[in-house]
């Protein structure tokens, strides 16, 4: 057999035995002569250096460039490839010699008591146990222990080759501590040397760079990059780095194994790249590759190197942010800078602190924006190294979809006496103000008798056929007043009023307000009754713990069976396809109340008294009367509002003042509370008594001291008291100048 590439000028060395394989018996002599065209050398098994004592290589007597290899008394271990080659070339001729030694069928490595085989637990990998044979056609099996297991060639993935050894999938013997080959010759077993099995891993789970991204430095700073490889057990890792300035003077690489918890199925390796003082040329892509021999994984990161620390706002930084009430608002501080700046947010000059409603960080987040969040927000970026500052103002405008004030106050059904003039009001608050408020109407019976898609408590009127109030044919005569603007509870509101000239027909009225961010509507049930009349005694709006009575008066000749009910807090659910039932026709939603009946010559009066009214007593009260002739039920509904008790407070301050003798002092003290507090004035802690010069007006709210005298100087106290306590404010009045002599003197 010939090995290597043929040379133009040289022929291959020629062997005296012209065979690829030679089989000889043990104890015989092996002799092979090799001839060629230049200096030759021999290589033989088990000793590549040519120092073996038993092997003799001699020059031929009959010619130049000829050498004879002689081995007397060959043994099984001499089995192998014998190679004759030209010195310093690849040109060679090879013969494979089997020395059949039935007492020692396996070739042993010189001085080896045992060998080592390295395997990986890869399902697809095979391993070769190098138990070579001195006989080519042996029946060889592989024994593995412990526990003992025998593997026999299967003509597929398990095989034995005398020149190579025993081939087997590595996972099959990964459990074993040692393996050996065994041959059976004439019922005799012959074993190769033992091979220790060493399982080596190869799997790399991941390679992680830290920091992983966004690495920024300025010239002269130290760069430290950590590359961590996580692998399976029994793995060795080789790290390789690629980076822009490979010839770096101040580069340092440290590789080490990291300790993992005992019992861990994983190993960790760390490679740290350090560059002490980076330059602009160190900017670029840094790649760390970890290799286990059978597997390589890599990871990259970009390192940016700035000339010096800096800070600036990015081009995408907003100056105006528009939002609608209730939305989440995010205003990111878009900046360019190194190192990352300190970010501070201010609203109208006041620093913002994070809490559950607002997060002031890289992004200013307002969880649920409200009107009071409107304003100018300033973000100040400070470079932590250079202390350079940049500021930017963002205006936040919060829009409010139209909200109709009365919506929360008015009951779903209110009754109006036939023939009366009534005014319906919609007070709209919206930002920006509504660009229109339109009124619509519809006959009550049309609405109540149309099949509806869905009716809910929030929208009890399923009707769709709304008509403009300009078209009041078949309804009440209407006039829409021009919108007015009012400051209510400190807010600019738009008030739209609709005047019903004469309440003749029961109808529904709807006001609809629209602005750029939404719409709001209020449906008013305008139920006209000729029936009973409700009055409240003694007050329209009682305060908690006061008593109130509802009087229902009906003409005795027309009506009978007067009954008081309270509308339940939640009317019964109305199912899809059902109609909203007028209060009178659905007594299931009503609670019957105890009341006392009185009569006079013409009327019956049913009085329902609430002693110690509470907030729970608020709601819609229904007086039901039955027509004596037709037995038809008539209902009147009245909403009762109970005011909460509020301790007295005094709005505004009394201020110390200096006045000259003979001038006047006018001060006012406005108190609020429920029940309304009584106001009293004191001078130097004694009750102030009215006289010709001291005048108290408007329920003692306003104090006037005319033609002040020196003795009017002192501490003045305004005190507002109710059953819930007192509130007071004080001021000192200084009177300057000399007292004029009076005529009496």
């Amino acid at each position: 057999a010939s090995v290597g590439l043929p040379s133009v000028s040289l022929d291959l060395p020629r062997l005296s035995i012209q065979k690829d394989i030679l089989t000889i018996k043990a104890n015989t002599t092996l002799q092979i002569t090799c001839r060629g065209q230049r200096d030759l050398d021999w290589l033989w098994p088990n000793n590549q250096s040519g120092s073996e004592q038993r092997v003799e290589v001699t020059e031929c007597s009959d010619g130049l460039f000829c050498k004879t290899l002689t081995i007397p008394k060959v043994i099984g271990n001499d089995t192998g490839a014998y190679k004759c080659f030209y010195r310093e070339t690849d040109l060679a001729s090879v013969i494979y010699v089997y020395v059949q030694d039935y007492r020692s069928p396996f070739i042993a490595s010189v001085s080896d008591q045992h060998g080592v085989v390295y395997i990986t637990e890869n399902k697809n990998k095979t391993v070769v146990i190098p138990c070579l044979g001195s006989i080519s056609n042996l029946n060889v099996s592989l024994c593995a222990r412990y526990p003992e297991k025998r593997f026999v060639p299967d003509g597929n993935r398990i095989s034995w080759d005398s020149k190579k050894g025993f081939t087997i999938p590595s996972y099959m013997i990964s459990y074993a501590g040692m393996v050996f080959c065994e041959a059976k010759i004439n019922d005799e077993s012959y074993q190769s040397i033992m091979y220790i099995v060493v399982v080596v891993g190869y799997r790399i789970y991941d390679v992680v760079l830290s920091p992983s991204h966004g690495i920024e430095l300025s010239v002269g700073e130290k760069l430290v990059l950590n590359c961590t490889a996580r692998t399976e057990l029994n793995v060795g890792i080789d790290f390789n780095w690629e980076y822009p300035s490979s010839k770096h003077q101040h580069k340092k690489l440290v590789n080490r194994d990291l300790k993992t918890q005992s019992g861990s199925e994983m190993k960790k390796f760390l490679s740290t790249l350090t560059i002490d003082g980076v330059t602009r040329s160190d900017q670029g892509l840094y790649t760390c590759a970890a290799s286990s021999g059978l597997m390589t994984k890599k990871n990259s990161t970009f390192v940016r190197v700035h000339e010096k620390p800096f800070v600036a706002f990015g081009s995408g930084m907003e100056s105006l942010v528009e939002a609608t009430v209730g939305e989440r608002v995010r205003i990111p501080a878009k900046y360019l800078g190194y190192p990352p700046p300190e970010i501070k947010w201010y609203k109208n000059g006041i620093p913002l602190e994070s809490n559950h409603t607002i997060k002031a960080g890289h992004v200013l987040t307002i969880m649920e924006v409200s009107e009071r969040d409107t304003g100018n927000y300033t973000v100040i970026l400070t470079n932590p190294i250079s202390k350079e500052k940049q500021s930017h103002v963002v205006s936040l405008v919060v829009y409010v979809p139209p909200q109709i004030g009365e919506k929360s106050l008015i009951s779903p059904v209110d009754s109006y006496q036939y023939g009366t003039t009534q005014t319906l009001t919609c007070t709209v608050y919206a930002i920006p103000p509504p660009h229109h408020i339109h009124w619509y109407w519809q006959l009550e019976e049309e609405c109540a008798n149309e099949p509806s898609q869905a009716v809910s408590v929030t929208n009890p009127y399923p009707c769709e056929e709304w008509r403009s109030v300009e078209d009041f044919q078949g309804g009440n005569k209407i006039e829409v007043n021009k919108n007015q603007f009012a400051l209510i509870e400190g807010k600019n509101k738009t008030v739209s009023t609709l005047v019903i000239q004469a309440a003749n027909v029961s109808a529904l009225y709807k006001c609809e307000a629209v602005n750029k961010v939404g719409r709001g509507e209020r449906v008013i049930s305008f139920h006209v009754t000729r029936g009973p009349e409700i009055t409240l005694q003694p007050d329209m709006q009682p305060t908690e713990q006061e008593s109130v009575s509802l009087w229902c008066t009906a003409d005795r000749s027309t009506f009978e069976n007067l009954t008081w009910y309270k509308l339940g807090p939640q009317p019964l659910p109305i199912h899809v396809g059902e109609l909203p039932t007028p209060v009178c026709k659905n007594l299931d939603t009503l609670w019957k109340l105890n009341a006392t009946m009185f009569s006079n010559s013409t009327n019956d009066i049913l009085i329902m008294e609430l002693k110690n009214a509470s907030l729970q007593d608020q709601g819609d009260y229904v007086c039901l009367a039955q027509d004596r002739k037709t037995k038809k039920r008539h209902c009147v509904v009245r909403q009762l509002t109970v005011l909460e008790r509020v301790a007295p407070t005094i709005t505004g301050n009394l201020e110390n003042q200096t006045t000259s003798i003979g001038e006047s002092i006018e001060v006012s003290c406005t108190a609020s509370g429920n029940p309304p507090p009584q106001i009293m004035w004191f001078k130097d802690n004694e009750t102030l008594v009215e006289d010709s010069g001291i005048v108290l007006k408007d329920g003692n709210r306003n104090l006037t001291i005319r033609r002040v005298r020196k003795e009017d100087e002192g501490l003045y106290t305004c005190q507002a008291c109710s059953v819930l306590g007192c509130a007071k404010v004080e001021a000192f009045f200084i009177i300057e100048g000399a007292q004029e002599k009076t005529n009496l003197e």
């Epitope: 009055t535 005694q537 003694p538 009575s549 009185f598 010559s601 009066i605 009085i607 008294e609 002693k611």
Partner: nanobody, 124 residues
């Protein structure tokens, strides 16, 4: 100072009659409304009858309708309650009450001034 003084109470057989008087001082019965209340043992005080400003209209609780009559004498500044066909369940302390001009004091919360009360006992 407003004062209301009841008189005319006493014991009577069922079916009998009594007239209660209420003498009012410091308060005009002609320009205000007046009423009568009663409180039976273990029960709440309840309105019996009322008369409005100037005596224009009179009001009666259902349980006394047709049996009791309220009236006033503006000259004497007196209010009366004529009780006929008395029943054992009419047994109570009867109070005179003064209210604002309108409405008549048929319930406690709109009463301004009270009398001390007079006992009426009806036996079967």
């Amino acid at each position: 100072q407003v004062q209301l003084q009841e008189s005319g109470g006493g014991s009577v057989q069922a079916g009998g009659s009594l007239t209660l008087s209420c003498e009012v001082s410091g308060y005009s019965v002609n320009s205000n409304s007046m009423g009568w209340f009663r409180q039976a043992p273990g029960k709440e005080r309840e309105g019996v009858a009322g008369i409005n400003e100037g005596g224009v209209s009179t009001y009666y609780a259902n349980f006394v309708q047709g049996r009791f009559t309220i009236s006033q004498d503006n000259a004497k500044n007196m209010v009366y309650l004529q009780m006929n066909s008395l029943k054992p369940e009419d047994t109570a302390i009867y109070y005179c009450a003064a209210g604002a001009p309108d409405p008549p004091p048929l319930i406690e919360s709109i009463v301004k001034y009270w009398g001390q009360g007079t006992q009426v006992t009806v036996s079967s």
